[in-house]
Interface confidence: medium
């Protein structure tokens, strides 16, 4: 075979076996799963249940408001990205249960594991878009009053999705199914044809575009926003801002292990002990990244409870309150100096 990374998205290799050979083949005499795989299965199960139900609820709540409320558009798109990724989980779950055997065919191998990467790129690009929106609301309120509309928000989301699809293509193209021996099984993974440079390039691009660059820009963005909000009176109830910061922070926390192990594996020799250890942890890192797909609804509910007191409202109305609050006050379009100042303060309720 060719240098094959067996697993979910893109890391996790075989050491080779002409076919796909796991760098750490399943013990030939054992039918028991490794501890990291068992933990991954538990996480996958929880993520699937919470992610499908939670994101479906978020989609339902925000879909009605998305025509007129810009925040609803952002949260709707994030939920759709997460929901799509959750749909692949039963397949990935089944594969791990069968010691990474992939009985679902080549097309499924290309598409389903790529969904989490599509989710990663879509999520971070949407978060970047949301963050830009937050930034503009605080620093360019007049521009927002004039131009910030649902149409522009949908265009921004479409661009984010288009770029996400574009960035997922390399993973999609390199995914293949191969045969593994002793005992026989079919594995689904990424085949770089032993081209370490290509593998490293993909890993570096993913790390930079999907993690480091967004981390840097969003950190700067929110530093400015938070400094501004905290420097003003009457800006302490920054509901949407708190939610967005929590969502952004969780994104980086849960993607960190996957990104770190991925970049390390692309630079390590497949026979090295560190590589072998990381390979064993691959499914766990992927499952950890998958937590992103169910964490947002949890954040929304927790935020809603914080803002509403105990659950006095129904879940949908609680979510509606968190997700569809509009940030820009639509008043007169002729501004005096005092109006601008007042508005800058009001828009802190982001």
């Amino acid at each position: 075979m060719n240098s094959f990374n067996y697993t979910t998205p893109d890391y996790g290799h075989y050491d080779d076996k002409d076919t796909l050979d796991l760098n750490t083949p399943v013990d030939k005499t054992s039918n028991t799963l490794r501890v990291p795989d068992i933990l991954a299965l538990v996480i996958f199960a929880v993520v699937f249940l919470v992610g499908v139900l939670g994101n479906a609820l978020v989609v339902w709540v925000t879909a009605f408001e998305a025509k007129r409320t810009i925040n609803a558009i952002w949260f709707l798109n994030l939920a759709v990205a997460d929901f799509l990724s959750c749909l692949a989980l039963p397949i990935l779950f089944t594969s791990i249960v069968q010691h990474h055997h992939w009985p679902f065919g080549g097309a499924a191998c290309s598409i389903l594991p790529s969904l989490i990467l599509l989710n990663m790129y879509a999520s971070i690009l949407l978060l970047a878009t949301i963050s830009a929106d937050r930034f503009l609301l605080v620093f360019k309120p007049i521009w927002c009053q004039n131009f910030r509309g649902a149409g522009l928000a949908w265009i921004a989301c479409a661009v984010a999705w288009g770029l996400a699809l574009l960035l997922t293509i390399p993973s999609f193209l390199y995914r293949v199914v191969r045969e593994e021996y002793f005992p026989p099984k079919v594995l689904c993974g990424v085949d770089y044809s032993h081209d370490k440079r290509r593998e490293r390039a993909v890993a570096i691009v993913r790390l930079v575009l999907g993690f480091l660059w967004p981390l840097l820009t969003l950190t700067i963005c929110y530093t400015f926003i938070l400094l501004r909000t905290w420097s003003r009176r009457a800006t302490r109830s920054t509901k949407t801002l708190k939610v967005v910061v929590a969502v952004v922070a969780s994104f980086f926390i849960f993607w960190l292990p996957y990104q770190v192990t991925g970049i390390m594996m692309s630079f390590l020799e497949p026979s090295s002990p560190t590589f072998l250890l990381l390979n064993k942890l691959d499914s766990l890192c992927v499952s950890f990244a998958y937590i992103n797909c169910c964490i947002n609804p949890i954040i929304y509910v927790v935020a809603g409870q914080g803002f509403q007191g105990r659950l006095r409202k129904s879940l949908p109305s609680l979510l509606r309150n968190v997700l569809t609050e509009e940030s820009v006050v639509r008043e007169s379009k002729s501004f005096t100096r005092s109006t601008v100042d007042t508005m800058a303060q009001k828009t802190q309720a982001v």
Epitope: M1, N2, S3, H13, Y14, D15, D16, K17, D18, T19, D21, N23, K28, Q98, H101, P103, R178, E179, Y181, F182, P183, P184, K185, V186, S193, H194, P270, S271
Partner: antibody, heavy 118, light 112 residues
């Protein structure tokens, strides 16, 4: 076309080691594994081991302690080394390319006839 | 280890006749995951290296004449030569690759 050419000594002293080199052409060692098999009148065909495309190996348990298979991808060479040879190790030794389909061996070397003398 | 048993050990037939040889394994070679039988057949003519004929129990290797047919599943397998030719004089081996690799002792085909 695919070829596997073997080179190594025909005669080995008892308790000494046997080294055979298998030089391949027509395919790349970074994409295909190479098996080693021997054939003796008394025992028929015996699978000895395999080196896979990424460099990992699987060995026949009966030979694991005294067998080593390595390779040099850039030179398209696979190296077979067996230690502590005895008279019953006298056989024809073959290298063969893995087919990737059913783990079969679709191309074989010409064979190296090895006689272990005491 | 999986033990492979071949029968008969030798047989002599006339050109044009149909011949069948058997191969049995000590455990099933059918993978429940891939739904394939990990059994191959090889032909070794006198003074030559073995040549792959059949893999996955019934898939003919490219370039192999269609008079060679592999069949069977699980533990019982058969190689059939529908119309033996003079050039088919050879030793025929079966080989399992389900759990490492082991070979049968071979069936020697002679032409009357």
């Amino acid at each position: 076309q695919v070829q596997l050419k073997q080179s190594g000594p025909g005669l080995v002293q008892s308790s000494q080691s046997l080294s055979i080199t298998c030089t391949v052409s027509g395919f790349s060692l970074i994409s295909y594994g190479v098996h080693w098999v021997r054939q003796s009148p008394g025992k028929g065909l015996e699978w000895l081991g395999v080196i896979w495309s990424g460099g990992s190996t699987d060995y026949n348990a009966a030979f694991k302690s005294r067998l080593s298979i390595t390779k040099d991808n850039s030179k398209s060479q696979v190296f077979f080394k067996m230690n502590s040879l005895q008279a019953d190790d006298t056989a024809i030794y073959y290298c063969a390319k893995n087919s990737q389909l059913g783990n079969a061996m679709d191309y074989w070397g010409q064979g190296t006839t090895v006689t272990v003398s005491s | 280890d999986i033990v492979m048993s071949q029968s008969p050990s030798s047989l002599a037939v006339s050109a044009g006749e149909k011949v069948t040889m058997s191969c049995k394994s000590s455990q099933s070679l059918l993978s429940s995951r891939t739904r394939k039988n990990y059994l191959a057949w090889y032909q070794q003519k006198p003074g030559q290296s073995p040549k792959l004929l059949i893999y996955w129990a019934s898939t003919r290797e490219s370039g192999v004449p269609d008079r060679f047919t592999g069949s069977g599943s699980g533990t019982d397998f058969t190689l059939t030569i529908s119309s033996v030719q003079a050039e088919d004089l050879a030793l025929y081996f079966c080989n399992q690759s389900y759990d490492l690799l082991t070979f049968g002792a071979g069936t020697k085909l002679e032409i009357k």
